[in-house]
C-alpha cells in the first residue's frame, strides 16, 4: 500500500530572465527513493538517480542546474517555459509517486509564489 | 579483499572494436554502481561511463557516445565496456572503479590496475 | 557540463611542508567533491570523499574542506610518499569530471 505524500511548491510564477527552484518532497513513507525524474509535459528534463547522481537532458543542460537536494533550477527563464513540471519519484517498495507544479512565467516584476500543496 | 581485474586491452586499428572485463570480488557487486575512466598516455583521467547497480542506468562521456558500451553481468560479478568504431584518441590505459554512489557522496572507492588500449594502423 | 579547474598544476615541496591545492567548480556542487592521488603507472587512489571525509585506511595528514564551488586538499607535512599526481573529481552529475591534476615534486 502507497501511504507517501509528495509535497511540491505548488503553482508559481516567476520573471522572464531569471530563475526558479522546482521542488518536491516525499513524505510519510519509509519506501526508498531510487531515482527522481523530473519532466516538462512529456520531456525529460533531468534525472538524480540514488547511485549515480544527476543527469541532465542535453537539450537542457545551459539552462537547467541540478538542486539544491532533489530540486531542479530552472535558469535564463523565458515565456516558453509556463507550463506543467513533474517531479517522479521511482521508490522501492512503493512504486511511483508524482508530484505537480504549475510554473508561469511573466514579463513584468509581479512574481510570486503560490501557496503549497499535497499531491497523494 | 576487494579487488577488481581488467582484462581485453591490446593493440587494434583504427575503426576496430575491443571488449573489456573488469572481474570484481571482495563486495556485493550488484549493489554498487560502476565506472570505467580512462587516461591518455601523459594526460589526465578521463571519465568514459557509468552503469548502474542494477544495469537499468548507464551514462556516457560526449566522446564516447554512441561508440562504446557499458554494461554488467551481476551474477558473474563483471562490468564490461565494448568498444566498437576506435579512434587513435581512445589509446589509454582503461580503468574499472567502484563507484560513485550519491546517497552516500562516495566516490570512487576501488580501482583496476588498468588495460591498455592502442589504437593503431 | 560541470568544468573543475585546479591549481597549481604542479609544485615544489620539501618534507615536513604544508601543502595546499585547491579546486574550482564551474557551478555548486555542493560537497560532491572527491580527491585522488594517483603514482607513476599505478592506478589513482580515494584519499577524500564528500569534500572532507577521509577515506578509510589513508592517513590521517590528508584533509579536506570546501562546498559550493570551491575546494582544498591539505597535507599537513608532507612526506616522501607523498609526491605524486593529485586530482580532484566532482561526483554530483555526469559527465563526472576531473581537475587537470596537481604533480607535488621534490624540491
Known amino acids: 500500500m502507497m501511504t507517501g505524500t509528495i509535497e511540491t511548491t505548488g503553482n508559481i510564477s516567476a520573471e522572464k530572465g531569471g530563475s526558479i527552484i522546482l521542488q518536491c518532497h516525499l513524505s510519510s513513507t519509509t519506501a526508498q527513493v531510487t531515482q527522481v525524474n523530473w519532466e516538462q509535459q512529456d520531456q525529460l528534463l533531468a534525472i538524480c538517480n540514488a547511485d549515480l547522481g544527476w543527469h541532465i537532458s542535453p537539450s537542457f543542460k545551459d539552462r537547467v542546474a541540478p538542486g539544491p537536494g532533489l530540486g531542479l533550477t530552472l535558469q535564463s527563464l523565458t515565456v516558453n517555459d509556463t507550463g506543467e513540471y513533474f517531479c517522479i519519484y521511482h521508490t522501492y517498495p512503493d512504486g511511483t509517486y508524482t508530484g505537480r507544479i504549475f510554473l508561469e512565467v511573466l514579463e513584468s516584476s509581479v512574481a510570486e509564489h503560490g501557496a503549497r500543496f499535497q499531491i497523494p | 579483499e576487494v579487488q577488481l581485474l581488467e582484462s581485453g586491452g591490446g593493440l587494434v586499428q583504427p575503426g576496430g572494436s575491443l571488449r573489456l572485463s573488469c572481474a570484481a570480488s571482495g563486495f556485493t557487486f550488484s549493489t554498487y554502481a560502476m565506472s570505467w575512466v580512462r587516461q591518455a598516455p601523459g594526460k589526465g583521467l578521463e571519465w568514459v561511463s557509468a552503469i548502474s547497480g542494477s544495469g537499468g542506468s548507464t551514462y556516457y562521456a560526449d566522446s564516447v557516445k554512441g561508440r562504446f558500451t557499458i554494461s554488467r553481468d551481476n551474477s558473474k560479478n563483471t562490468l564490461y565496456l565494448q568498444m566498437n568504431s576506435l579512434r587513435a584518441e581512445d589509446t589509454a590505459v582503461y580503468y574499472c572503479?567502484?563507484?560513485?554512489?550519491?546517497?552516500?557522496?562516495?566516490?570512487?572507492?576501488?580501482w583496476g590496475q588498468g588495460t591498455t588500449v592502442t589504437v593503431s594502423s | 557540463d560541470i568544468q573543475m579547474t585546479q591549481s597549481p598544476s604542479s609544485l615544489s615541496a620539501s618534507v615536513g611542508d604544508r601543502v595546499t591545492i585547491t579546486c574550482r567548480a564551474s557551478?555548486?556542487?555542493?560537497?560532491?567533491l572527491n580527491w585522488y592521488q594517483q603514482k607513476p603507472g599505478k592506478a589513482p587512489k580515494l584519499l577524500i570523499y564528500a569534500a572532507s571525509s577521509l577515506q578509510s585506511g589513508v592517513p590521517s595528514r590528508f584533509s579536506g574542506s570546501g562546498s559550493g564551488t570551491d575546494f582544498t586538499l591539505t597535507i599537513s607535512s608532507l612526506q616522501p610518499e607523498d609526491f605524486a599526481t593529485y586530482y580532484c573529481q566532482q561526483s554530483l552529475a555526469t559527465p563526472y569530471t576531473f581537475g587537470g591534476g596537481t604533480k607535488v615534486e621534490i624540491k
Open positions: 557551478q555548486s556542487i555542493s560537497s560532491y
Open positions: 572503479a567502484k563507484g560513485p554512489r550519491y546517497q552516500d557522496r562516495a566516490g570512487m572507492d576501488v
